[in-house]
């Protein structure tokens, strides 16, 4: 019952990882994460 990080993200395209409650697309280079996505394989809010 130790638990590990969730399984790999199964989303179309690259650069998805679990952020918050879902797999989210990461932010482009030079941007930072303002808020994670709120749906599976969604887009994070980046600044």
């Amino acid at each position: 019952q130790g638990g590990t990080r969730s399984p790999r993200c199964d989303c179309a395209g690259d650069f998805h990882k679990k952020i918050g409650l879902f797999c989210c697309r990461g932010c482009p280079a030079g941007h930072y994460l303002k808020a994670p996505c709120t749906e599976p394989c969604g887009n994070s809010t980046c600044l």
């Epitope: 019952q1 130790g2 638990g3 590990t4 990080r5 969730s6 399984p7 993200c9 199964d10 989303c11 179309a12 679990k18 952020i19 918050g20 409650l21 879902f22 797999c23 808020a35 994670p36 709120t38 749906e39 599976p40 394989c41």
Partner: antibody, heavy 120, light 111 residues
Framework: EVQLVESGGGLVQPGGSLRLSCAAS????????MSWVRQATGKGLEWVAA???????FYPGSVKGRFTISRENAKNSLYLQMNSLRAGDTAVYYC??????????????WGQGTLVTVSS | DIQMTQSPSSLSASVGDRVTITCRAS??????????MHWYQQKPGKAPKLLIY???NLESGVPSRFSGSGSGTDFTLTISSLQPEDFATYYC?????????FGGGTKVEIK
């Protein structure tokens, strides 16, 4: 054995505040996303708040700005600070663990709940 | 928000019966190759228990008489042969987006 034990419920007047606690054991608490879900007597389930293992918090519009979820991994504890309480917040509040096989929120273990009654 | 409508709200059945409960979402809960619909069982005075995740996957330890199906907006929970311990209330839940929402429940009672 996974265990989630809620506490802190009780009777509070409208406009008042209450802090619920959930003591977790039997698993590595810091690795898991966690939620609070409530159920009014004889009614269905309503998701109230979530705290992801990587530090993000999430709320539905019905409680945003009034409720605050927090966690203390060193104490294996989840909390729900409830302010500006209304009669409609009266319910049993459950602490729930999200399944670690899932990259989406689904709850695989639940506590037995703590009753919050908002009444004058 | 996605509204979840369960039907029937209650039903009476006998031990050994095949029972079907439906859940309809106000918009599709299927995306990226998965249907983000889950089912729970709750007995009076007890916490909910996860039965089915991603529409059709049986949670570990749940008897095989429980099954789930569906995609898009329409989903079904089936109990192939109702047992005495299955008399309870059943809820669907989506995780297609936030906020998470649950159906209103279906109470399965003894005929």
């Amino acid at each position: 054995e996974v265990q989630l034990v809620e506490s802190g419920g009780g009777l509070v007047q409208p406009g008042g505040s209450l802090r619920l606690s959930c003591a977790a054991s039997g698993f590595t608490f810091s690795n898991y996303d966690m939620s609070w879900v409530r159920q009014a007597t004889g009614k269905g389930l309503e998701w109230v708040a979530a705290f992801s293992s990587d530090g993000y918090t999430f709320y539905p519009g019905s409680v945003k700005g009034r409720f605050t979820i927090s966690r203390e991994n060193a104490k294996n504890s989840l909390y729900l600070q409830m302010n500006s309480l209304r009669a409609g917040d009266t319910a049993v509040y459950y602490c729930a663990r999200h399944a670690d096989y899932a990259n989406y929120p689904v709850m695989d273990y639940w506590g037995q709940g703590t009753l919050v009654t908002v009444s004058s | 928000d996605i509204q979840m409508t369960q039907s029937p709200s209650s039903l009476s059945a006998s031990v050994g019966d095949r029972v079907t409960i439906t859940c309809r979402a106000s918009k599709s809960v299927s995306t990226s190759g998965y249907s983000y619909m889950h089912w729970y069982q709750q007995k009076p005075g007890k916490a909910p228990k996860l039965l089915i995740y991603l529409a059709s996957n049986l949670e570990s330890g749940v008897p095989s008489r429980f099954s789930g199906s569906g995609s898009g907006t329409d989903f079904t929970l089936t109990i192939s042969s109702l047992q005495p311990e299955d008399f309870a209330t059943y809820y669907c839940q989506h995780s297609r987006e936030l906020p998470l929402t649950f159906g209103g429940g279906t109470k399965v009672e003894i005929k």
